[in-house]
């Protein structure tokens, strides 16, 4: 057993033209965090395949807001080490994947938005217990500087953390302070004992009696934060020389709090407030099991049967995140079809459908022929998955619900006057023409070319008074029809509005629930 440790020194635009000015999008401020993934062997594995050796997520870095006209600074990074514990032997050869993620803090519907900014993959050989290895990697226009190492946790020792070093009660041939290591009884090994007083948070040692400082800390016991930074060279976290170190304004700067714990300064020290499921001086101990209820919003916890095992959360609809803590705007997936309005009520999605559509997702078109949606005697004509209405005389529109003006097309020929009527239209023909549409000329001798057709009306015709009477009746009928239509429409609208108010009231109640 042991721990793989990764220290991110810097992440920012690489040298050269075309380097990005800011990691944030135009939508506003953002902050960075890192994910490390370890896979055994040197094979080029897909980033999506399991991180068989383990994975870790850093805390969120400070909020970064781009300053207009200002040069792109070093980006503020999350504090502290990323630690990936491994339970079995350290494989020696491994793939290291480091992802830089951006969390946008603008006005996102449903909370912050995450996007992958850069991913670097390295295939490496590394012995456990060795010094920090340093690296610079490019990912597109970005540059990442980091150091890493693998160390065993007692009683495991050795380059693969496979040998167990146990104190023995029997006298041994080892010298003072040394102890025999199984399986070789005559092999003695001392875990490195750091210099007395060496900071547990900011220092470490590879040889007994030394105290080597992490990035941002200096002094014989690594207690002194470095106050200035002029450059960032390739020195690793074991560097104790001045320069090329990240500034550290206080005891919380090195982020001694692991697992997303928040650090607060106390006189001469710090205090960690740990998130749910973590405890210890630096929130380094996870005692979470499913019985602790680590999944928020009713999420289902799987695993965690024993205190050492991890758990995963299976989230309810509308939530995501490792602990189901992040709300998803399910309406962003546009589940409502045919222009329906989406409402995320938290415990359910509701689609408010446009007129003519129904169903949980407004997927049913009420205006199909099966619904006989053609009004006023219209005939439904289907074809190619769509439908249309062939309307009766005097009606139009998609569903034949609109009154059509039969005179709009000017059906009366030769200057005939058109009058609309419930049963259709009537043409009053100009002198010299006759027929239903005034389409036939009358012969000069007064004999029609088509004697079977009823003659049109001419001035001085004895039937003229009768026609005028008909026209007056038609006009009165039209006015009466319009009045009836307006009244019935108002009644319908009042009924619809009443139903809509009731529906909105119900939705308001559900949203409040």
């Amino acid at each position: 057993a042991g721990v793989f440790e990764l220290q991110i020194h810097s992440f920012g635009p690489g040298p050269g033209p075309g380097a990005p000015r800011s990691p944030c999008s135009a939508r506003g401020p953002c902050r960075l965090f890192f994910r490390v993934c370890l896979k055994p062997g040197l094979s080029e594995e897909a980033a999506e395949s399991p991180c068989a050796l383990g994975a870790a997520l850093s805390a969120r870095g400070p909020v970064y807001t781009e300053q207009p006209e200002a040069p792109a600074p070093d980006l503020p990074l999350p504090n502290g080490l990323l630690q990936v514990p491994f339970r079995d032997a350290w494989p020696g050869t491994f793939s290291l994947i480091i992802e830089t993620w951006r969390e946008e803090l603008g006005d996102q519907i449903g909370g912050p938005a995450w996007s992958l900014l850069a991913r670097v993959t390295r295939r490496r050989r590394l012995a456990a217990g060795g010094p920090w290895a340093r690296d610079i990697q490019r990912a597109g226009a970005w540059e990442l500087r980091f150091s890493y190492r693998a160390r065993c946790e007692l009683p495991a020792v050795g380059t693969a953390c496979t040998r167990l070093c146990r104190p023995r009660s029997a006298p041994s041939r080892c010298g003072p302070g040394l102890r025999p290591c199984a399986p070789l009884e005559d092999e003695c090994e001392a875990p490195p004992v750091c210099r007395a007083g060496c900071s547990l948070e900011h220092g470490f040692c590879e040889q007994p009696g030394e105290c080597r400082c992490l990035e941002g800390w200096t002094g014989p016991l690594c207690m002194v934060p470095v106050s200035t930074s002029s450059c960032l060279g390739l020195r690793g976290p074991s560097s104790t020389t001045t320069g090329c170190l990240v500034p550290g304004p206080g005891p919380c700067d090195g982020n001694p709090c692991a697992n997303g714990g928040s650090c607060s300064e106390t006189p001469g020290s710090f205090e960690c407030t740990c998130p749910r499921g973590f405890y210890g001086l630096r929130c380094e101990v996870s005692g979470v099991t499913c019985a602790d209820g680590p999944c928020f919003n009713g999420g289902l916890c799987v695993g965690g049967a024993d205190p050492d095992s991890a758990y995963i959360c299976h989230c309810p609809p509308g939530f995501q995140g490792s602990n189901c803590e992040k709300r998803v705007d399910r309406c962003s997936l546009q589940p409502c079809r045919n222009g329906g309005l989406c409402l995320d009520l938290g415990h359910a999605l509701r689609c408010r459908c446009r007129a003519g559509f129904a169903g949980p997702r407004c997927e049913h078109d009420l205006d199909d022929c099966a619904g006989r949606a053609c009004a006023n005697g219209g005939t439904c004509v289907e074809g190619g998955g769509a439908h249309r209405c062939s309307c009766a005389l005097g009606f139009g529109g998609r569903n034949c619900r609109e009154r059509a003006d039969p005179c709009a097309a000017r059906p009366c020929a030769h200057g005939g006057r058109c009058y609309a009527h419930f049963s259709g239209l009537v043409c009053a023909c100009a002198p010299g023409y006759m027929g239903a549409r005034c389409e036939f000329p009358v012969h000069p001798d007064g004999v029609s070319a088509l004697p079977a057709a009823p003659p049109g009306l001419r001035p001085g015709d004895p039937q003229r008074a009768g026609v005028i009477a008909v026209i007056v009746v038609v006009v009165i009928a039209i006015v009466a029809g319009i009045v009836v239509l307006v009244i019935s429409r108002k009644k319908r609208m009042a009924k619809y509005e009443k139903a809509e108010i009731k529906e909105m009231g119900e939705m308001h109640r559900e949203l409040n629930a």
Epitope: R276, C290, A291, D292, G293, P294, C295, N297, G298, G299, L300, C301, H314, P316, P317, H347, A348, L349, P360, R361, A513
Partner: antibody, heavy 117, light 107 residues
């Protein structure tokens, strides 16, 4: 070991009231949504209602069939959730289970409620 | 509310045989379906969540599949302790609803 133990069931006349309790052990009770699910004799399962956490202002939700008659409450300090049943009907006769979470992962052994004249 | 229809109502099989239980939803529920087992006189027990994931401690002979409206619970080789009533439940839309159950009995 996680345990949910229901109690308070019994025989009651139509229109009467009953209060069921569910005592939890082996879990950090205050972190769990709690539900009541019932099962009528020789019938399937029916969700009755749910109470969420203190951080959710102890929000409650109920099935339409019991809305206005049943009330769920919880006492985190006692690791207990309650179901207050008023205006009971014969169709409320069932075994009542308490369960946890959105997905009903842990279940109690149930308590029988019989509504009969 | 979403309606779940389970079939068959009863399945008569012998130990060692394969059991296939069906659950159909009245509308799309994604993969938000769970399966529960209930033995006589006992409370239900969660077997499968998310349509195809075995819950903690559930033997590998139980498997779930499906998405949308059609779901299946398969018991690859029936053990004597598997004879019970199985319910599917949907958790896509609130309130959660259950199917009427399938009784797996010894032939």
């Amino acid at each position: 070991e996680v345990q949910l133990v229901e109690s308070g069931g019994g025989l009651v006349k139509p229109g009467g009231s009953l209060r069921l309790s569910c005592a939890a052990s082996g879990i950090t009770f205050s972190n769990f949504w709690m539900n009541w699910v019932r099962q009528a004799p020789e019938k399937g399962l029916e969700w009755v209602g749910q109470i969420r956490l203190k951080s959710d202002d102890y929000a409650t939700h109920y099935a339409e069939s019991v809305k206005g008659r049943f009330t769920i409450s919880r006492e985190d300090s006692k690791n207990t959730v309650y179901l207050q049943m008023n205006s009971l009907k014969t169709e409320d006769t069932a075994v009542y289970y308490c369960t946890t979470g959105y997905y009903f992962d842990y279940w109690g052994q149930g308590t029988t409620v019989t509504v009969s004249s | 509310n979403i309606v779940l229809t389970q079939s068959p109502a009863t399945l008569s099989l012998s130990p060692g045989e394969r059991a296939t239980l069906s659950c159909k939803a009245s509308e799309n529920v994604g993969t938000y379906v769970s399966w529960f087992q209930q033995k006589p006189g006992q409370s239900p027990r969660l077997l499968i969540y998310g349509a195809s994931n075995r819950y903690t401690g559930i033997p590998a002979r139980f498997s779930g599949s499906g998405s949308g409206t059609d779901f299946t619970l398969t018991i690859s080789s029936l053990e004597p302790e598997d004879f019970a009533v199985y319910y599917c439940g949907q958790f896509y839309s609130f309130p959660s609803t259950f199917g009427g159950g399938t009784k797996v009995e010894i032939k």
